[in-house]
């Protein structure tokens, strides 16, 4: 640790005195202290001499000697009082700048330690301190306002009692800056803009911060725009607004617009795109396939994306048949706006009934005209099966009719015994009919197919079963020949409940 000579913590001298402070260390040493006049420095190796031959009250202060090479960073200090009866205060600063909630040191140094008992801090022109101002005093350092607040940004004076009267220091301005959490907050509206050539447009870029010291600008395709700035202060925030008004837009106004704001903490920017078009437009699209297949009883949402400018003047969902003349219930249709120029329209069709298959059209209108997008909805059904015994061209024939969607496949089984459904152990013979005859196949309806099984002689202790299946499910019908004719068994369970 360096050593200061004279080796006293405090030194009191009169104005005009010669003061010599010597610091000695193991290595090179250096002096530090408040900026003040009249000092000269002389160094020789491991010692440094700070001297003045004309001390004034302005030399009052704490002088510290450090050894830069010392890893422990040891230092020694001496406080010098230059006791001037006419000048009780040495004010080191004109202004003190701190952030809110920091301690603010107002460096009024007493030039005479004897005066410490009668010191006080006041605002200029003798005004008392604001309520809740918590401060302390040190003759070496001055007054400290603890946890300074923005509202305490004032001009202060230090007061000392000398011979029964108060002597004021020159004033110190305290600037308490609000803590800036980051770059200014930004808004750029609209987030997207479309205009037809010749229309008017407005783009507003605004920034706000707790501190007034920030800059904001609007740029178009990297060119800074010269726009008058409006400033405001509300909700304890400073606001700066740039408004770009375009009376008649043209294609050169289109492009990217960026709102940029910066302060000591950094920069924020946000962008939007301005599109200029020749005329109104209306585009309908769907991410879904326009041809939909859904199992009966299930639900479906039909979604249409609309891109339009100007906005829609009308829209609706229409059922185009072929079954009933019912129309979709308005409560099942909803619209969500993705942004100003893009919307999604959804038609919800819960628990679909057979009569709800068909074409659904979404129609929309704006000044650009009408547009429509049509979905075709086909319902899937599990097969329904029936078998009859008949004679065709004199031959005994089992006739199986199967109805469902998609088109069912047909398989015939012959099994031993009388049963509602052949199981593997009983099966005597299996015939697949790869090409059953299609009896009816209309759009949005079930497909009905017919399969024939010619049987020369019906075996009485056997069962003939027609099975039909598709991607939705399967159905079957068992035919049991009996002496008095034939007996047919539909399956036990009723396979289809819409």
């Amino acid at each position: 640790i360096p050593v200061i000579e004279p080796s006293v913590p405090e030194l009191v001298v009169k104005p005009g005195a010669t003061v010599t402070l010597r610091c000695v260390g193991n290595g090179s040493v250096e002096w530090d202290g408040p900026p003040s006049p009249h000092w000269t420095l002389y160094s020789d190796g491991s010692s440094s001499i700070l001297s003045t031959n004309n001390a004034t009250f302005q030399n009052t202060g704490t002088y510290r000697c450090t050894e830069p090479g010392d890893p422990l960073g040891g230092s020694a200090a001496i406080h010098l009082y230059v006791k001037d009866p006419a000048r009780p205060w040495n004010v080191l600063a004109q202004e003190v700048v701190v952030f809110e909630d920091q301690d603010a040191l107002l460096p009024c140094l007493l030039t005479d330690p004897v005066l410490e008992a009668g010191v006080s801090l006041v605002r200029v022109r003798g005004r008392p301190l604001m309520r809740h101002t918590n401060y302390s005093f040190s003759p070496w350092h001055g007054f400290t306002i603890h946890r300074a607040k923005f509202i305490q940004s004032q001009d202060y004076q230090c007061s000392a009692l000398m011979g029964g009267r108060k002597v004021m220091s020159i004033s110190i301005r305290l600037k308490v800056q609000k803590v800036i959490p980051g770059p200014p907050a930004l808004t750029l509206v609209p987030a997207e803009l479309v205009r037809i050539r010749g229309e008017a447009a407005q783009i507003v870029c605004s920034a706000s911060s707790v501190d007034v010291n920030f800059d904001v600008f609007l740029q178009h395709n990297n060119t800074k725009l010269a726009i008058p700035q409006q400033s405001d202060f509300h909700n304890n925030r400073y606001q700066k607004v740039l408004t770009l008004n375009l009376d008649q837009v043209d294609f050169q106004h289109a492009g990217n617009y960026s709102c940029v704001a910066s302060n000591v903490q950094g920069k924020h920017s946000t962008s939007m795109f301005f599109r200029v078009v020749e005329s109104a437009y209306l585009n309908l699209s769907s991410e879904q396939n326009l041809i939909q297949e859904v199992t009966v009883g299930e639900g479906l949402n039909l979604k249409v994306m609309v891109e339009a400018y100007p906005g829609l003047q009308g829209f609706n969902w229409t059922y185009l048949g072929p079954f009933s003349d019912h129309q979709p219930e308005p409560k099942l249709a909803n619209a969500t706006t993705k942004d100003t120029y893009r919307h999604t329209f959804t038609l919800s069709l819960p628990r679909l009934k057979p009569s709800e298959a068909g074409r659904y059209s979404f129609l929309a209108r704006n000044p650009g005209g009408w547009r429509a997008l049509t979905f075709e909805l086909t319902l899937r059904y599990p097969p329904e099966v029936s078998v009859i015994w008949t004679f065709i061209n004199g031959s005994g024939t089992l006739l199986c009719a199967a109805s469902g969607y998609p088109q069912p496949n047909v398989t015939w089984l012959q099994c031993s015994g009388h049963t509602d459904r052949c199981d593997e152990a009983q099966v005597l013979q299996v015939w697949d009919d790869p090409y059953p005859e299609v009896l009816s196949q209309e759009p949005f309806h079930k497909v009905t197919v017919q399969s024939l099984l010619t049987v020369e002689t019906l075996e009485h202790n056997q069962t003939y079963e027609c099975r039909a299946h598709n991607s939705v499910g399967s159905g079957s019908w068992a035919f049991i020949p009996i002496s008095a004719g034939a007996h047919t068994h539909p399956p036990d369970e009723f396979l289809f409940t819409p």
Partner: antibody, heavy 117, light 110 residues
Framework: QVQLQESGPGLVKPSETLSLTCTVS????????WSWIRQSPGRGLEWIGY???????KYNPSLMSRVTISADTSKNQFSLKLSSVTAADTAVYYC???????????WGQGTLVTVSS | QSVLTQPPSASGTPGQRVTISCSGS????????VNWYQQLPGTAPKLLIY???QRPSGVPDRFSGSKSGTSASLAISGLQSEDEADYYC???????????FGGGTKLTVL
């Protein structure tokens, strides 16, 4: 070795505020005092002001109404703000470390600030 | 107009001794220490002399400073081509309550 580096915009519009930051490395701004000095062809070297004790400032009387110097000890930086600038404020701005005896032993490399519309 | 007065230019040949003067008043040089700075073209000023005659480490002893009354001078002996630069004097000014500078002297090595 103490190093100082000025940063900030090189172009400022008239009537706006000039803002510069000096980042100090190799030493703490809690010791010594830290100054802003500018140099222009018309006026030579001109002391703007200094900050010490991390918040106490003194300014050149000719600039006092327009200048604020502040410090951020957590970042070891000090800043200059000069408001209502005119073309006369066009200069190279230096930050420097001040020492007892009133000399500047370390300087930043300087940054040219032009005031123009 | 600078507070401290310096000749705008000075010159000398290599090996020569050159002196640059700096004149002030009692509120600056008369009461306070004088410091000198060297500014090479395109660079920041560099401390050359502090407290009238003290050289920071790294400054050759060819550079020396002196003060008398309200004037100061910088002497460069054994002039070298790399000494070609602008030289500024500076001192604390009691009335300004801050440092003041001279207008600078451009030294040319012929």
């Amino acid at each position: 070795q103490v190093q100082l580096q000025e940063s900030g915009p090189g172009l400022v519009k008239p009537s706006e505020t000039l803002s510069l930051t000096c980042t100090v490395s190799g030493g703490s701004i809690s010791s010594f005092y830290w100054s802003w000095i500018r140099q222009s062809p018309g006026r030579g070297l001109e002391w703007i002001g200094y900050i010490f004790y991390s918040g106490s400032t003194k300014y050149n009387p000719s600039l006092m109404s327009r200048v604020t110097i502040s410090a951020d000890t957590s970042k070891n930086q000090f800043s200059l703000k000069l408001s209502s600038v005119t073309a006369a404020d066009t200069a190279v701005y230096y930050c420097a470390r001040g020492r007892l005896g009133n000399y500047f032993d370390y300087w930043g490399q300087g940054t040219l600030v032009t005031v123009s519309s | 107009q600078s507070v401290l007065t310096q000749p705008p230019s000075a010159s000398g040949t290599p090996g020569q001794r050159v002196t640059i003067s700096c004149s002030g008043s009692s509120s600056n040089i008369g009461n306070n220490a004088v410091n000198w700075y060297q500014q090479l073209p395109g660079t920041a000023p560099k401390l050359l002399i502090y407290s009238n005659n003290q050289r920071p480490s790294g400054v050759p002893d060819r550079f020396s400073g002196s003060k008398s009354g309200t004037s100061a001078s910088l002497a460069i002996s054994g002039l070298q081509s790399e000494d070609e630069a602008d030289y500024y004097c500076a001192a604390w000014d009691d009335s300004l309550n801050g440092p003041v500078f001279g207008g600078g002297t451009k030294l040319t090595v012929l």
